[in-house]
């Protein structure tokens, strides 16, 4: 809290300008009118203020707008946004995409901070829906934001946004989210050639159906085990031993180390032991020779 002191003679600010740069904390508090500051916020962004000075300017705005800043001020906060708390931001009503972009730009070097998360939440609530323009903006700044959305919200993500996604941004996505994102990625990357396509689609394959995995197995992609272990179990189970061998290429040897883990464990249980033996990896647990496999789910469907 800055002490209330009278403004020295001749120091009263008539406008927000470069002369304020060397005002001490108490001089800024005493000599800058909050209403003037609010109307000239765009000028604040042109002056290289220190954090100490920004703290005083924030304090003045807080006093002027105890119920929360108007959007005309929010849009021009610039680096002052870094001084805001989630509690401050919860008082805002942000509806302009330009305002959102301006503040995300200031924060772009950070991971998603509590301030940004609160800002996005306020923005989406203010708009009433998560439209394509908003998602485009959010995924451009925070590709990892995708994994924080529900499958329903993800359904409105434009395929063009997928290009900005890095593999690590999908680390926290669950299978339900990847089910929604995979078809979008497939569409986004459809014009790429085989090897380039695989590099881009690889991190989305946790949402791929069996037929797409079968198709990939014909393209010498050499999928690594880490990617294979993230595939949907129900998509892996119908793959033949030959298809898995082609899909993994030289990485097929890694199946031995993962034979007790899903989806490898469940896939082994579905394969004929004879077929597994052709891999020469010592995988055990397949269907013994001479046994008949009945697909009970198919039987139930027919009855």
């Amino acid at each position: 809290e800055v002490e209330k002191t009278a403004c020295p003679s001749g120091k009263k600010a008539r406008e927000i300008d470069e002369s304020l740069i060397f005002y001490k904390k108490w001089e800024l508090e005493a000599c800058v009118d909050a209403a003037l500051l609010a109307t000239q916020m765009d000028r604040v962004n042109a002056i290289p203020f220190t954090y100490e000075q920004l703290d005083v300017l924030k304090h003045k705005l807080d006093e002027l707008y105890p119920q929360g800043y108007p959007e005309s001020v929010i849009q021009h906060l610039g680096y002052l946004f870094l001084k805001m708390s989630p509690e401050d931001i919860r008082k805002w009503n942000v509806t302009s995409l330009e305002t959102l972009k301006a503040l995300l730009e200031v924060n772009k070097g950070h991971e998603m901070s509590p301030q940004v998360a609160t800002l996005i939440d306020r923005f989406v609530k203010g708009r009433g829906q998560l439209d394509k323009d908003t998602l485009d903006t959010l995924t451009a700044f925070y590709p990892g934001y995708l994994c924080s959305l529900s499958p329903e919200e993800l359904s409105s993500v434009p395929p063009s946004s997928i290009w900005a996604v890095r593999p690590q941004d999908l680390d926290t996505c669950d299978p339900r989210q990847l089910d929604v994102l995979y078809p979008k990625a497939r569409l986004a990357f459809q014009n790429m050639n085989g090897s380039e396509y695989f590099v881009k689609i690889q991190s989305f394959l946790g949402g791929a159906p069996t037929e797409d995995l079968k198709a990939l197995s014909q393209q010498n992609v050499s999928m690594d085990l880490a990617t294979f272990m993230k595939l949907r179990t129900d998509a892996v189970l119908p793959l033949t031993v030959a298809e898995v061998q082609k899909l993994l290429g030289p990485h097929v040897e890694g199946l031995k180390a993962e034979e007790r883990h899903r989806p490898v464990r469940d896939w082994i249980l579905r394969q004929r032991q004879d077929d597994l033996d052709t891999l020469g990896l010592g995988l055990q647990g397949g269907i013994p020779n001479g046994y008949l496999v009945l697909d009970l789910s198919m039987q139930e469907a027919l009855s």
């Epitope: 470069e18 604040v44 290289p48 220190t50 954090y51 610039g78 680096y79 070097g109």
Partner: antibody, heavy 119, light 106 residues
């Protein structure tokens, strides 16, 4: 592409004068506050002087106050440092740098020019 | 405000995790920046607001801290990271720098 190119450095005797120049390109020079920062051989960085975008607000470190004068010509996209009454301790590489708009950080730097004060 | 960096120099190998500290003589909130300077080159802004990565800076660089104690970490040192690193406070004028930390090849 932002570029800051310093010139004017050289060998000068104690008590002598030099004028450093910094030519700016690739950004709107008149929008930015500019600084001179120096680095003595084997030492750290020292903020020497600073000038606001219009040139009306100026700062000098105590170590150079009364001897150095900073100025700018926005029409020529140039920053200057007039150095008088030079001392051996002024020997350093002098960098010109732009301050970030809105925050007191040094965003872009030149390659530096060496000033050697020696008899 | 005085900034003290430690160590003043260190030797490390490619792939090593490197940590540099900067201590302020008084609290400066998160108003700290880190710069990288290679021999004969201009310093380059890496991090501001203690932890915010400047555009184009590799993610192996990270910053942390608040108040008086700050850290710059390079998670896996690359050949191009051998340089001198400086901290700078922008909490109040006059702006000041730390003495620098030289990262050398072991």
């Amino acid at each position: 592409q932002v570029q800051l190119v310093e010139s004017g450095g050289g060998l000068v005797k104690p008590g002598g004068s030099l004028r450093l120049s910094c030519a700016a390109s690739g950004f709107t020079f008149s929008d930015y506050y500019m600084s001179w920062i120096r680095q003595a051989p084997g030492k750290g960085l020292e903020w020497v002087s600073y000038i606001s975008s219009s040139g009306s607000t100026i700062y000098y470190a105590d170590s150079v106050k009364g001897r150095f004068t900073i100025s700018r010509d926005n029409a020529k996209n140039s920053l200057y440092l007039q150095m008088n009454s030079l001392r051996a301790e002024d020997t350093a590489v002098y960098y010109c740098a732009s301050l970030q708009r809105g925050l007191a950080l040094f965003q872009h730097w030149g390659q530096g020019t060496l000033v050697t004060v020696s008899s | 405000i005085q900034l003290t960096q430690s160590p003043s120099s260190l030797s490390a190998s490619v792939g090593d995790r490197v940590t540099i500290t900067c201590r302020a003589s008084q609290g400066i909130s998160s108003a700290l920046a880190w710069y990288q300077q290679k021999p004969g080159k201009a310093p380059k802004l890496l991090i501001y607001d203690a932890s915010s990565l400047e555009s184009g800076v590799p993610s192996r660089f990270s910053g942390s801290g608040s108040g008086t104690d700050f850290t710059l970490t390079i998670s896996s040192l690359q050949p191009e990271d051998f340089a001198t690193y400086y901290c700078q406070q922008f909490n109040s004028y006059p702006l000041t720098f730390g003495g620098g930390t030289k990262v050398e090849i072991k």
